[in-house]
Protein backbone atom coordinates (compact mmCIF):
# COMPACT_ATOMS: atom_id res chain seq x y z
CA UNK A 1 0.00 0.00 0.00
CA UNK A 2 1.07 3.52 -0.65
CA UNK A 3 2.08 6.09 1.89
CA UNK A 4 -0.68 8.67 2.15
CA UNK A 5 0.15 12.06 0.72
CA UNK A 6 2.02 14.35 3.03
CA UNK A 7 -0.06 17.16 4.32
CA UNK A 8 1.18 20.67 4.01
CA UNK A 9 2.22 20.78 7.61
CA UNK A 10 2.56 17.16 8.50
CA UNK A 11 5.75 15.19 8.24
CA UNK A 12 6.54 13.52 4.99
CA UNK A 13 6.03 10.41 6.89
CA UNK A 14 9.41 10.56 8.45
CA UNK A 15 12.92 10.80 7.20
CA UNK A 16 14.58 8.28 5.08
CA UNK A 17 18.10 7.31 5.44
CA UNK A 18 20.02 5.56 2.84
CA UNK A 19 20.48 2.02 3.70
CA UNK A 20 22.47 0.04 1.23
CA UNK A 21 19.81 -0.13 -1.34
CA UNK A 22 20.10 -2.42 -4.29
CA UNK A 23 18.24 -1.20 -7.33
CA UNK A 24 14.86 -2.58 -6.47
CA UNK A 25 11.31 -2.18 -7.56
CA UNK A 26 10.76 0.78 -5.36
CA UNK A 27 13.70 2.59 -6.85
CA UNK A 28 12.05 2.60 -10.21
CA UNK A 29 8.91 4.43 -11.06
CA UNK A 30 5.87 2.26 -10.99
CA UNK A 31 4.00 1.87 -14.22
CA UNK A 32 1.44 4.37 -13.17
CA UNK A 33 4.05 6.81 -12.05
CA UNK A 34 6.28 6.97 -15.04
CA UNK A 35 5.57 5.84 -18.51
CA UNK A 36 9.07 6.10 -19.81
CA UNK A 37 12.61 4.94 -19.41
CA UNK A 38 14.91 6.02 -16.69
CA UNK A 39 18.58 6.12 -16.41
CA UNK A 40 20.74 3.92 -14.35
CA UNK A 41 22.99 5.30 -11.72
CA UNK A 42 25.89 7.19 -13.07
CA UNK A 43 29.37 7.82 -12.06
CA UNK A 44 31.12 10.98 -13.13
CA UNK A 45 30.41 14.60 -12.74
CA UNK A 46 28.98 16.86 -15.35
CA UNK A 47 26.22 19.41 -15.34
CA UNK A 48 22.68 18.26 -15.70
CA UNK A 49 19.60 19.93 -16.99
CA UNK A 50 17.49 19.56 -14.04
CA UNK A 51 19.71 21.35 -11.75
CA UNK A 52 21.27 23.68 -14.13
CA UNK A 53 19.89 25.87 -16.79
CA UNK A 54 19.07 24.26 -20.05
CA UNK A 55 21.40 21.89 -21.69
CA UNK A 56 20.15 23.05 -24.99
CA UNK A 57 21.25 26.54 -24.24
CA UNK A 58 24.80 25.53 -24.90
CA UNK A 59 25.75 22.67 -27.12
CA UNK A 60 28.62 21.96 -24.83
CA UNK A 61 29.50 22.85 -21.30
CA UNK A 62 32.94 24.30 -21.44
CA UNK A 63 34.65 26.84 -19.29
CA UNK A 64 34.77 30.31 -20.72
CA UNK A 65 37.99 32.21 -21.12
CA UNK A 66 38.93 34.95 -18.72
CA UNK A 67 37.85 37.53 -21.23
CA UNK A 68 34.44 35.95 -21.58
CA UNK A 69 33.78 35.97 -17.89
CA UNK A 70 32.23 33.30 -15.77
CA UNK A 71 30.00 30.56 -17.01
CA UNK A 72 26.38 31.55 -16.73
CA UNK A 73 23.46 29.47 -15.73
CA UNK A 74 22.00 29.73 -19.14
CA UNK A 75 25.16 28.29 -20.56
CA UNK A 76 24.74 25.00 -18.82
CA UNK A 77 22.85 21.98 -19.95
CA UNK A 78 19.38 21.41 -18.70
CA UNK A 79 17.56 18.51 -17.16
CA UNK A 80 15.86 15.79 -19.11
CA UNK A 81 12.84 13.63 -18.68
CA UNK A 82 12.07 10.13 -17.46
CA UNK A 83 11.44 6.94 -19.29
CA UNK A 84 9.63 3.65 -19.19
CA UNK A 85 9.42 1.89 -15.91
CA UNK A 86 9.92 -1.35 -17.73
CA UNK A 87 13.39 -0.28 -18.64
CA UNK A 88 15.49 1.03 -15.79
CA UNK A 89 17.44 3.19 -18.10
CA UNK A 90 17.32 6.88 -18.76
CA UNK A 91 18.17 7.48 -22.33
CA UNK A 92 19.35 10.75 -23.69
CA UNK A 93 18.62 11.96 -27.15
CA UNK A 94 21.34 13.59 -29.15
CA UNK A 95 20.00 16.51 -31.09
CA UNK A 96 20.48 17.02 -34.77
CA UNK A 97 23.42 19.35 -34.51
CA UNK A 98 23.96 17.42 -31.44
CA UNK A 99 27.02 17.58 -29.58
CA UNK A 100 27.49 15.07 -26.82
CA UNK A 101 26.14 17.47 -24.26
CA UNK A 102 23.35 19.29 -25.93
CA UNK A 103 19.78 18.13 -26.06
CA UNK A 104 18.39 15.29 -24.02
CA UNK A 105 15.08 13.61 -23.89
CA UNK A 106 13.57 11.37 -21.36
CA UNK A 107 13.36 8.03 -23.02
CA UNK A 108 15.43 8.76 -26.10
CA UNK A 109 18.58 7.13 -27.38
CA UNK A 110 21.43 6.63 -26.70
CA UNK A 111 21.36 5.61 -23.03
CA UNK A 112 22.40 8.43 -20.72
CA UNK A 113 25.58 6.72 -19.46
CA UNK A 114 26.80 6.56 -23.03
CA UNK A 115 26.28 10.29 -23.38
CA UNK A 116 27.71 11.08 -19.97
CA UNK A 117 29.50 8.38 -17.98
CA UNK A 118 28.54 10.22 -14.80
CA UNK A 119 24.98 9.03 -15.31
CA UNK A 120 26.18 5.54 -14.40
CA UNK A 121 27.73 6.73 -11.14
CA UNK A 122 26.99 5.13 -7.80
CA UNK A 123 25.58 8.18 -6.06
CA UNK A 124 22.87 9.48 -8.31
CA UNK A 125 19.61 11.35 -7.85
CA UNK A 126 16.70 11.30 -7.39
CA UNK A 127 16.17 8.73 -4.64
CA UNK A 128 13.33 7.23 -2.68
CA UNK A 129 13.17 8.76 0.80
CA UNK A 130 12.32 6.30 3.56
CA UNK A 131 11.60 8.31 6.68
CA UNK A 132 11.95 5.35 8.99
CA UNK A 133 15.52 4.88 7.89
CA UNK A 134 16.59 8.50 8.04
CA UNK A 135 19.35 9.50 10.42
CA UNK A 136 18.17 12.28 12.72
CA UNK A 137 20.83 14.97 12.81
CA UNK A 138 20.21 17.73 15.35
CA UNK A 139 23.17 19.53 13.79
CA UNK A 140 21.06 20.24 10.70
CA UNK A 141 19.84 23.72 11.49
CA UNK A 142 17.01 25.62 9.77
CA UNK A 143 17.93 26.78 6.29
CA UNK A 144 18.67 30.47 5.92
CA UNK A 145 17.54 32.35 2.82
CA UNK A 146 18.52 35.93 2.17
CA UNK A 147 17.48 38.18 -0.68
CA UNK A 148 14.86 35.79 -2.06
CA UNK A 149 12.12 38.44 -1.96
CA UNK A 150 12.78 39.98 -5.34
CA UNK A 151 11.29 43.29 -6.41
CA UNK A 152 9.14 43.28 -9.57
CA UNK A 153 11.91 44.97 -11.52
CA UNK A 154 14.19 43.89 -13.04
CA UNK A 155 12.16 41.16 -14.70
CA UNK A 156 13.33 37.56 -14.82
CA UNK A 157 13.70 35.19 -17.75
CA UNK A 158 11.22 32.29 -17.85
CA UNK A 159 12.10 29.70 -20.47
CA UNK A 160 10.76 26.45 -21.88
CA UNK A 161 14.01 24.65 -22.52
CA UNK A 162 12.34 21.52 -23.84
CA UNK A 163 12.96 19.63 -20.62
CA UNK A 164 11.39 21.88 -18.03
CA UNK A 165 10.28 25.42 -17.37
CA UNK A 166 13.16 27.35 -15.91
CA UNK A 167 13.36 30.69 -14.15
CA UNK A 168 16.79 32.30 -14.19
CA UNK A 169 17.52 34.06 -10.93
CA UNK A 170 19.49 37.29 -10.53
CA UNK A 171 22.58 37.68 -8.36
CA UNK A 172 22.04 38.25 -4.66
CA UNK A 173 19.94 35.27 -3.57
CA UNK A 174 21.94 33.71 -0.75
CA UNK A 175 21.24 30.42 0.96
CA UNK A 176 23.02 28.74 3.86
CA UNK A 177 22.69 25.06 4.67
CA UNK A 178 24.56 25.78 7.88
CA UNK A 179 27.61 27.65 9.15
CA UNK A 180 30.20 27.88 6.41
CA UNK A 181 27.93 26.14 3.90
CA UNK A 182 26.90 29.12 1.85
CA UNK A 183 25.41 29.17 -1.64
CA UNK A 184 24.04 31.50 -4.29
CA UNK A 185 20.79 30.62 -6.10
CA UNK A 186 21.12 30.34 -9.87
CA UNK A 187 17.84 29.09 -11.25
CA UNK A 188 14.75 27.14 -10.44
CA UNK A 189 12.76 24.70 -12.49
CA UNK A 190 9.96 22.18 -12.08
CA UNK A 191 9.30 18.51 -12.74
CA UNK A 192 5.80 17.19 -13.28
CA UNK A 193 3.71 14.35 -14.62
CA UNK A 194 0.61 14.21 -16.80
CA UNK A 195 -3.12 13.96 -16.26
CA UNK A 196 -3.65 11.56 -13.40
CA UNK A 197 0.03 10.69 -13.29
CA UNK A 198 2.32 12.23 -10.67
CA UNK A 199 5.71 13.54 -11.70
CA UNK A 200 7.94 14.38 -8.77
CA UNK A 201 11.52 13.18 -9.03
CA UNK A 202 12.04 12.15 -5.43
CA UNK A 203 9.58 9.78 -3.85
CA UNK A 204 8.67 9.03 -0.23
CA UNK A 205 8.37 5.35 0.54
CA UNK A 206 7.59 4.84 -3.12
CA UNK A 207 4.96 7.55 -3.21
CA UNK A 208 5.36 10.00 -6.06
CA UNK A 209 3.93 13.49 -5.69
CA UNK A 210 2.25 15.48 -8.47
CA UNK A 211 5.26 17.73 -9.07
CA UNK A 212 8.51 19.00 -7.60
CA UNK A 213 10.36 22.31 -7.59
CA UNK A 214 14.16 22.51 -7.65
CA UNK A 215 16.07 25.65 -6.74
CA UNK A 216 19.67 25.21 -7.88
CA UNK A 217 22.53 26.86 -6.02
CA UNK A 218 26.28 27.29 -6.50
CA UNK A 219 28.62 27.18 -3.52
CA UNK A 220 30.25 30.50 -2.72
CA UNK A 221 33.53 28.59 -2.70
CA UNK A 222 33.32 28.52 -6.49
CA UNK A 223 33.16 31.40 -8.92
CA UNK A 224 31.73 29.39 -11.78
CA UNK A 225 29.44 26.45 -12.21
CA UNK A 226 31.88 24.48 -14.33
CA UNK A 227 34.39 24.62 -11.46
CA UNK A 228 31.83 23.27 -9.00
CA UNK A 229 30.53 20.37 -11.07
CA UNK A 230 31.35 17.06 -9.48
CA UNK A 231 32.92 18.65 -6.44
CA UNK A 232 31.34 17.60 -3.14
CA UNK A 233 28.98 20.36 -2.10
CA UNK A 234 29.79 22.43 -5.18
CA UNK A 235 26.12 22.59 -6.04
CA UNK A 236 23.11 22.41 -3.75
CA UNK A 237 19.48 21.96 -4.70
CA UNK A 238 16.48 22.79 -2.55
CA UNK A 239 13.61 20.51 -3.51
CA UNK A 240 9.98 20.61 -2.48
CA UNK A 241 7.02 18.48 -3.42
CA UNK A 242 3.97 20.13 -4.94
CA UNK A 243 0.58 18.65 -4.30
CA UNK A 244 -3.06 19.48 -4.75
CA UNK A 245 -4.82 21.78 -2.34
CA UNK A 246 -8.15 23.61 -2.31
CA UNK A 247 -6.89 27.09 -3.15
CA UNK A 248 -4.93 28.79 -5.88
CA UNK A 249 -1.31 29.43 -4.93
CA UNK A 250 -0.76 33.10 -5.78
CA UNK A 251 3.04 32.83 -5.82
CA UNK A 252 3.00 30.01 -8.37
CA UNK A 253 0.28 31.72 -10.36
CA UNK A 254 2.76 34.48 -11.22
CA UNK A 255 4.68 31.86 -13.20
CA UNK A 256 1.93 29.48 -14.27
CA UNK A 257 -0.13 32.29 -15.77
CA UNK A 258 2.71 32.92 -18.21
CA UNK A 259 3.22 29.37 -19.46
CA UNK A 260 1.01 29.83 -22.50
CA UNK A 261 3.46 32.43 -23.75
CA UNK A 262 6.25 29.85 -23.74
CA UNK A 263 4.31 26.80 -24.86
CA UNK A 264 6.75 26.21 -27.70
CA UNK A 265 10.07 24.53 -26.97
CA UNK A 266 12.90 27.05 -26.78
CA UNK A 267 10.61 30.03 -26.22
CA UNK A 268 11.02 32.43 -23.35
CA UNK A 269 9.36 35.42 -21.78
CA UNK A 270 10.05 37.90 -19.02
CA UNK A 271 8.19 37.87 -15.75
CA UNK A 272 8.15 40.33 -12.87
CA UNK A 273 10.46 39.52 -10.00
CA UNK A 274 8.66 37.75 -7.18
CA UNK A 275 9.20 36.33 -3.73
CA UNK A 276 11.10 33.17 -4.59
CA UNK A 277 10.85 31.93 -1.01
CA UNK A 278 7.05 31.93 -1.40
CA UNK A 279 7.46 29.10 -3.91
CA UNK A 280 8.93 26.94 -1.15
CA UNK A 281 7.37 25.50 1.99
CA UNK A 282 7.28 27.85 4.98
CA UNK A 283 9.01 25.43 7.34
CA UNK A 284 12.74 25.68 6.70
CA UNK A 285 13.60 23.61 9.76
CA UNK A 286 12.33 20.18 8.73
CA UNK A 287 14.02 18.55 5.78
CA UNK A 288 15.92 15.54 4.47
CA UNK A 289 19.44 15.86 3.14
CA UNK A 290 21.77 13.62 1.16
CA UNK A 291 24.54 13.81 -1.41
CA UNK A 292 23.54 12.92 -4.95
CA UNK A 293 23.73 14.21 -8.50
CA UNK A 294 22.11 16.26 -11.15
CA UNK A 295 19.10 14.32 -12.37
CA UNK A 296 19.86 14.71 -16.06
CA UNK A 297 22.98 14.47 -18.13
CA UNK A 298 25.69 15.19 -17.33
CA UNK A 299 24.50 13.75 -13.98
CA UNK A 300 27.36 15.38 -12.07
CA UNK A 301 27.70 14.06 -8.53
CA UNK A 302 28.57 15.86 -5.32
CA UNK A 303 25.26 17.73 -5.30
CA UNK A 304 23.78 18.36 -1.85
CA UNK A 305 20.07 17.69 -1.97
CA UNK A 306 17.76 19.22 0.62
CA UNK A 307 14.21 17.93 0.35
CA UNK A 308 11.63 19.76 2.45
CA UNK A 309 9.39 17.74 4.70
CA UNK A 310 6.52 20.17 4.19
CA UNK A 311 4.82 20.25 0.81
CA UNK A 312 3.56 23.18 -1.23
CA UNK A 313 -0.10 23.26 -2.21
CA UNK A 314 -1.34 24.24 -5.68
CA UNK A 315 -4.89 24.05 -6.95
CA UNK A 316 -5.95 21.25 -9.26
CA UNK A 317 -6.25 23.77 -12.07
CA UNK A 318 -2.71 24.99 -11.47
CA UNK A 319 -1.28 21.48 -11.51
CA UNK A 320 -3.16 20.85 -14.73
CA UNK A 321 -1.77 24.04 -16.25
CA UNK A 322 1.73 22.96 -15.31
CA UNK A 323 1.44 19.53 -16.87
CA UNK A 324 -0.64 20.39 -19.90
CA UNK A 325 0.64 23.64 -21.37
CA UNK A 326 4.20 23.19 -22.55
CA UNK A 327 5.57 21.38 -25.58
CA UNK A 328 8.90 19.62 -25.77
CA UNK A 329 10.99 18.13 -28.55
CA UNK A 330 9.44 16.50 -31.58
CA UNK A 331 5.95 17.95 -31.27
CA UNK A 332 5.38 16.06 -28.05
CA UNK A 333 3.92 17.49 -24.89
CA UNK A 334 6.42 18.33 -22.19
CA UNK A 335 5.22 15.90 -19.55
CA UNK A 336 6.56 13.27 -17.18
CA UNK A 337 9.91 15.03 -17.08
CA UNK A 338 11.34 13.10 -14.18
CA UNK A 339 14.09 10.54 -13.80
CA UNK A 340 13.52 7.24 -12.06
CA UNK A 341 14.72 6.97 -8.49
CA UNK A 342 18.27 5.69 -8.16
CA UNK A 343 19.79 3.27 -5.64
CA UNK A 344 21.27 4.73 -2.48
CA UNK A 345 24.24 2.38 -2.64
CA UNK A 346 25.00 2.83 1.03
CA UNK A 347 24.24 6.51 1.30
CA UNK A 348 22.47 7.67 4.42
CA UNK A 349 19.70 10.22 4.10
CA UNK A 350 19.78 12.56 7.05
CA UNK A 351 16.82 14.32 8.60
CA UNK A 352 16.83 17.59 10.49
CA UNK A 353 14.03 16.26 12.69
CA UNK A 354 13.19 12.87 14.19
CA UNK A 355 11.44 11.68 11.06
CA UNK A 356 11.59 8.01 11.83
CA UNK A 357 9.79 8.37 15.12
CA UNK A 358 6.09 7.71 15.16
CA UNK A 359 5.56 9.17 11.75
CA UNK A 360 5.16 6.45 9.21
CA UNK A 361 1.92 4.55 9.05
CA UNK A 362 3.78 1.68 7.40
CA UNK A 363 6.18 0.77 10.17
CA UNK A 364 5.48 -2.93 10.12
CA UNK A 365 8.76 -4.55 11.05
CA UNK A 366 11.29 -2.89 13.34
CA UNK A 367 13.99 -0.93 11.59
CA UNK A 368 17.55 -0.12 12.47
CA UNK A 369 17.83 3.65 12.49
CA UNK A 370 20.97 5.05 10.92
CA UNK A 371 23.21 7.27 12.96
CA UNK A 372 23.83 10.86 12.09
CA UNK A 373 27.04 11.43 10.19
CA UNK A 374 27.04 15.12 11.00
CA UNK A 375 26.83 14.64 14.75
CA UNK A 376 28.93 17.09 16.66
CA UNK A 377 28.95 19.72 13.90
Amino acid sequence: QRLPRMQEDSPLGGGSSGEDDPLGEEDLPSEEDSPREEDPPGEEDLPGEEDLPGEEDLPEVKPKSEEEGSLKLEDLPTVEAPGDPQEPQNNAHRDKEGDDQSHWRYGGDPPWPRVSPACAGRFQSPVDIRPQLAAFCPALRPLELLGFQLPPLPELRLRNNGHSVQLTLPPGLEMALGPGREYRALQLHLHWGAAGRPGSEHTVEGHRFPAEIHVVHLSTAFARVDEALGRPGGLAVLAAFLEEGPEENSAYEQLLSRLEEIAEEGSETQVPGLDISALLPSDFSRYFQYEGSLTTPPCAQGVIWTVFNQTVMLSAKQLHTLSDTLWGPGDSRLQLNFRATQPLNGRVIEASFPAGVDSSPRAAEPVQLNSCLAAGD
Partner: antibody
Framework: EVQLVESGGGLVQPGGSLRLSCAAS????????MHWVRQAPGRGLEWVAF??????????QYSASVKGRFTISRDNAENSLYLQMNSLRAEDTAVYYC???????????????WGKGTTVTVSS | DIQMTQSPSTLSASVGDRVTITCHVS??????LSWYQQKPGNAPKLLIY???NLHTGVPSRFSGSGSGTEFTLTIGSLQPDDFVTYYC?????????FGQGTKVEIK
Protein backbone atom coordinates in the same frame (compact mmCIF):
# COMPACT_ATOMS: atom_id res chain seq x y z
CA GLU B 1 12.09 69.37 -18.88
CA VAL B 2 10.69 65.85 -19.04
CA GLN B 3 7.68 65.84 -21.33
CA LEU B 4 5.29 63.46 -23.10
CA VAL B 5 2.93 64.72 -25.79
CA GLU B 6 0.25 62.48 -27.29
CA SER B 7 -1.46 62.88 -30.66
CA GLY B 8 -3.58 60.88 -33.10
CA GLY B 9 -6.85 60.64 -31.23
CA GLY B 10 -10.18 61.19 -32.92
CA LEU B 11 -13.55 59.78 -33.83
CA VAL B 12 -13.60 56.35 -35.44
CA GLN B 13 -16.31 53.82 -36.26
CA PRO B 14 -16.50 50.43 -34.53
CA GLY B 15 -14.17 48.01 -36.29
CA GLY B 16 -11.97 50.86 -37.46
CA SER B 17 -8.33 51.65 -36.73
CA LEU B 18 -6.36 54.51 -35.26
CA ARG B 19 -2.71 55.11 -34.50
CA LEU B 20 -1.69 57.11 -31.47
CA SER B 21 1.72 58.73 -31.15
CA CYS B 22 3.65 60.07 -28.19
CA ALA B 23 6.67 62.33 -28.47
CA ALA B 24 9.05 62.05 -25.53
CA SER B 25 11.69 64.59 -24.53
CA UNK B 26 13.91 65.55 -21.62
CA UNK B 27 15.10 62.05 -20.67
CA UNK B 28 17.00 59.07 -22.07
CA UNK B 29 14.09 57.39 -23.82
CA UNK B 30 15.75 53.99 -24.30
CA UNK B 31 16.25 53.55 -20.56
CA UNK B 32 12.56 53.49 -19.80
CA UNK B 33 9.61 51.17 -20.04
CA MET B 34 6.85 53.14 -21.77
CA HIS B 35 3.13 52.58 -21.21
CA TRP B 36 -0.29 53.50 -22.46
CA VAL B 37 -2.96 53.97 -19.80
CA ARG B 38 -6.54 54.92 -20.62
CA GLN B 39 -9.49 56.45 -18.82
CA ALA B 40 -13.03 56.00 -20.09
CA PRO B 41 -15.37 58.99 -19.59
CA GLY B 42 -16.23 59.34 -15.91
CA ARG B 43 -14.36 56.14 -15.09
CA GLY B 44 -11.14 55.06 -13.45
CA LEU B 45 -7.72 54.32 -14.90
CA GLU B 46 -6.92 51.20 -16.91
CA TRP B 47 -3.47 50.08 -17.95
CA VAL B 48 -3.39 49.11 -21.63
CA ALA B 49 0.11 48.09 -22.67
CA PHE B 50 3.80 48.68 -22.18
CA UNK B 51 6.97 48.21 -24.17
CA UNK B 52 10.17 47.35 -22.34
CA UNK B 53 13.39 49.34 -22.34
CA UNK B 54 16.59 48.62 -24.23
CA UNK B 55 18.02 46.47 -21.44
CA UNK B 56 14.94 44.24 -21.61
CA UNK B 57 14.80 43.97 -25.38
CA UNK B 58 11.96 46.37 -26.19
CA UNK B 59 9.39 43.56 -25.95
CA UNK B 60 5.68 44.38 -25.45
CA GLN B 61 3.10 43.39 -22.87
CA TYR B 62 -0.66 43.89 -23.20
CA SER B 63 -3.73 43.82 -21.04
CA ALA B 64 -6.18 41.04 -21.86
CA SER B 65 -8.78 43.52 -23.09
CA VAL B 66 -6.63 44.74 -25.99
CA LYS B 67 -4.35 41.80 -26.73
CA GLY B 68 -4.53 40.84 -30.39
CA ARG B 69 -6.10 44.15 -31.38
CA PHE B 70 -3.60 46.77 -30.21
CA THR B 71 0.12 46.92 -30.96
CA ILE B 72 2.56 49.03 -28.99
CA SER B 73 5.84 50.04 -30.59
CA ARG B 74 8.58 52.60 -30.23
CA ASP B 75 10.98 54.48 -32.47
CA ASN B 76 14.01 55.07 -30.29
CA ALA B 77 15.76 57.25 -32.86
CA GLU B 78 12.77 59.60 -32.80
CA ASN B 79 12.02 59.22 -29.08
CA SER B 80 8.49 58.23 -30.01
CA LEU B 81 5.97 55.74 -28.67
CA TYR B 82 3.04 54.41 -30.69
CA LEU B 83 -0.18 52.52 -30.18
CA GLN B 84 -1.76 50.96 -33.24
CA MET B 85 -5.39 50.25 -32.43
CA ASN B 86 -7.36 47.90 -34.71
CA SER B 87 -10.83 46.39 -34.48
CA LEU B 88 -11.91 49.24 -32.24
CA ARG B 89 -14.98 48.83 -30.04
CA ALA B 90 -17.23 51.30 -28.26
CA GLU B 91 -15.64 50.27 -24.96
CA ASP B 92 -12.26 51.50 -26.21
CA THR B 93 -13.58 55.06 -26.01
CA ALA B 94 -11.30 56.86 -23.57
CA VAL B 95 -8.59 59.41 -23.02
CA TYR B 96 -5.30 57.63 -23.77
CA TYR B 97 -2.27 58.68 -21.76
CA CYS B 98 1.34 58.07 -22.70
CA UNK B 99 3.18 57.26 -19.48
CA UNK B 100 6.77 56.73 -18.41
CA UNK B 101 7.29 54.00 -15.86
CA UNK B 102 10.16 51.77 -14.87
CA UNK B 103 13.83 51.89 -15.84
CA UNK B 104 17.12 50.19 -15.05
CA UNK B 105 17.15 51.58 -11.53
CA UNK B 106 13.48 51.01 -10.73
CA UNK B 107 12.41 48.17 -8.51
CA UNK B 108 8.78 48.16 -9.59
CA UNK B 109 6.36 49.83 -11.98
CA UNK B 110 5.12 53.23 -11.00
CA UNK B 111 4.09 55.94 -13.43
CA UNK B 112 6.06 59.08 -12.76
CA UNK B 113 5.50 61.10 -15.92
CA TRP B 114 2.18 61.38 -17.77
CA GLY B 115 1.23 63.13 -21.00
CA LYS B 116 -1.90 65.27 -21.15
CA GLY B 117 -3.75 62.55 -23.05
CA THR B 118 -5.47 62.22 -26.40
CA THR B 119 -9.16 61.38 -26.78
CA VAL B 120 -10.35 58.39 -28.77
CA THR B 121 -14.07 58.08 -29.48
CA VAL B 122 -15.42 54.91 -31.04
CA SER B 123 -18.95 55.47 -32.26
CA SER B 124 -21.10 54.90 -35.28
CA ASP C 1 -5.54 39.82 -11.83
CA ILE C 2 -4.82 41.72 -8.64
CA GLN C 3 -7.91 43.57 -7.47
CA MET C 4 -7.66 46.98 -5.83
CA THR C 5 -10.44 48.33 -3.62
CA GLN C 6 -10.35 51.89 -2.35
CA SER C 7 -12.44 53.19 0.50
CA PRO C 8 -14.29 55.35 0.84
CA SER C 9 -15.41 56.08 -2.71
CA THR C 10 -16.26 59.62 -1.66
CA LEU C 11 -14.94 61.50 1.33
CA SER C 12 -16.38 64.78 2.62
CA ALA C 13 -14.02 66.95 4.63
CA SER C 14 -13.06 70.53 5.35
CA VAL C 15 -9.92 72.54 4.77
CA GLY C 16 -7.42 71.74 7.51
CA ASP C 17 -8.83 68.27 8.19
CA ARG C 18 -6.62 65.20 8.37
CA VAL C 19 -8.00 62.52 6.05
CA THR C 20 -7.11 58.94 5.32
CA ILE C 21 -7.86 56.91 2.21
CA THR C 22 -7.48 53.13 2.29
CA CYS C 23 -6.50 50.75 -0.49
CA HIS C 24 -7.13 47.04 -0.02
CA VAL C 25 -5.32 44.66 -2.38
CA SER C 26 -6.53 41.13 -3.18
CA UNK C 27 -3.10 39.59 -2.64
CA UNK C 28 0.19 40.42 -1.02
CA UNK C 29 2.07 43.02 -3.05
CA UNK C 30 4.75 43.80 -0.47
CA UNK C 31 5.26 47.58 -0.79
CA UNK C 32 4.79 47.83 -4.55
CA LEU C 33 2.02 50.38 -4.40
CA SER C 34 1.71 53.97 -5.65
CA TRP C 35 -0.77 56.78 -5.08
CA TYR C 36 -1.85 59.32 -7.70
CA GLN C 37 -3.80 62.56 -7.62
CA GLN C 38 -6.01 63.58 -10.55
CA LYS C 39 -7.58 66.97 -11.00
CA PRO C 40 -10.59 67.29 -13.34
CA GLY C 41 -9.52 67.46 -16.98
CA ASN C 42 -5.89 66.71 -16.16
CA ALA C 43 -3.64 63.66 -16.22
CA PRO C 44 -2.91 61.89 -12.95
CA LYS C 45 0.20 62.90 -10.98
CA LEU C 46 2.36 60.59 -8.90
CA LEU C 47 2.25 61.39 -5.19
CA ILE C 48 3.67 58.38 -3.37
CA TYR C 49 5.68 55.41 -4.63
CA UNK C 50 6.73 52.20 -2.92
CA UNK C 51 3.90 52.65 -0.41
CA UNK C 52 5.54 55.42 1.59
CA ASN C 53 8.04 57.38 -0.49
CA LEU C 54 7.11 60.93 -1.41
CA HIS C 55 7.65 61.75 -5.08
CA THR C 56 9.77 64.80 -5.89
CA GLY C 57 7.91 68.06 -5.49
CA VAL C 58 4.95 66.62 -3.59
CA PRO C 59 4.03 68.55 -0.41
CA SER C 60 4.95 66.86 2.86
CA ARG C 61 1.33 66.88 4.06
CA PHE C 62 0.91 63.76 1.90
CA SER C 63 2.14 60.49 3.36
CA GLY C 64 1.66 56.82 2.65
CA SER C 65 1.96 53.68 4.71
CA GLY C 66 1.21 49.98 4.65
CA SER C 67 2.49 46.77 3.13
CA GLY C 68 1.10 43.46 2.02
CA THR C 69 -2.58 43.98 1.34
CA GLU C 70 -3.54 47.13 3.29
CA PHE C 71 -2.32 50.61 2.41
CA THR C 72 -3.27 54.14 3.39
CA LEU C 73 -2.79 57.59 1.97
CA THR C 74 -2.98 60.35 4.55
CA ILE C 75 -3.34 64.05 3.91
CA GLY C 76 -2.21 65.77 7.09
CA SER C 77 -4.04 69.05 6.60
CA LEU C 78 -6.34 69.41 3.61
CA GLN C 79 -5.70 72.38 1.36
CA PRO C 80 -8.18 73.80 -1.18
CA ASP C 81 -6.17 72.18 -4.00
CA ASP C 82 -6.56 68.73 -2.49
CA PHE C 83 -10.29 68.34 -3.15
CA VAL C 84 -9.83 66.04 -6.14
CA THR C 85 -9.67 62.31 -6.91
CA TYR C 86 -7.00 59.88 -5.66
CA TYR C 87 -6.05 56.48 -7.06
CA CYS C 88 -3.89 53.65 -5.77
CA UNK C 89 -2.04 51.37 -8.21
CA UNK C 90 -0.17 48.11 -7.78
CA UNK C 91 3.13 47.66 -9.59
CA UNK C 92 3.81 44.11 -8.45
CA UNK C 93 2.74 42.41 -11.66
CA UNK C 94 0.87 43.06 -14.84
CA UNK C 95 -1.81 43.72 -15.70
CA UNK C 96 -1.19 46.76 -13.54
CA UNK C 97 -4.37 47.64 -11.75
CA PHE C 98 -5.75 50.79 -10.15
CA GLY C 99 -8.26 51.33 -7.42
CA GLN C 100 -11.61 52.75 -8.50
CA GLY C 101 -10.70 56.14 -7.05
CA THR C 102 -11.63 58.19 -4.01
CA LYS C 103 -13.13 61.62 -4.55
CA VAL C 104 -12.37 64.08 -1.77
CA GLU C 105 -15.03 66.76 -1.70
CA ILE C 106 -15.68 69.81 0.41
CA LYS C 107 -18.10 69.21 3.26
Amino acid sequence: EVQLVESGGGLVQPGGSLRLSCAASGFTFTDYYMHWVRQAPGRGLEWVAFIRNKASGYTPQYSASVKGRFTISRDNAENSLYLQMNSLRAEDTAVYYCVRGGHAGSNYWYFDVWGKGTTVTVSS
Amino acid sequence: DIQMTQSPSTLSASVGDRVTITCHVSQNINVWLSWYQQKPGNAPKLLIYQASNLHTGVPSRFSGSGSGTEFTLTIGSLQPDDFVTYYCQQGQSYPFTFGQGTKVEIK
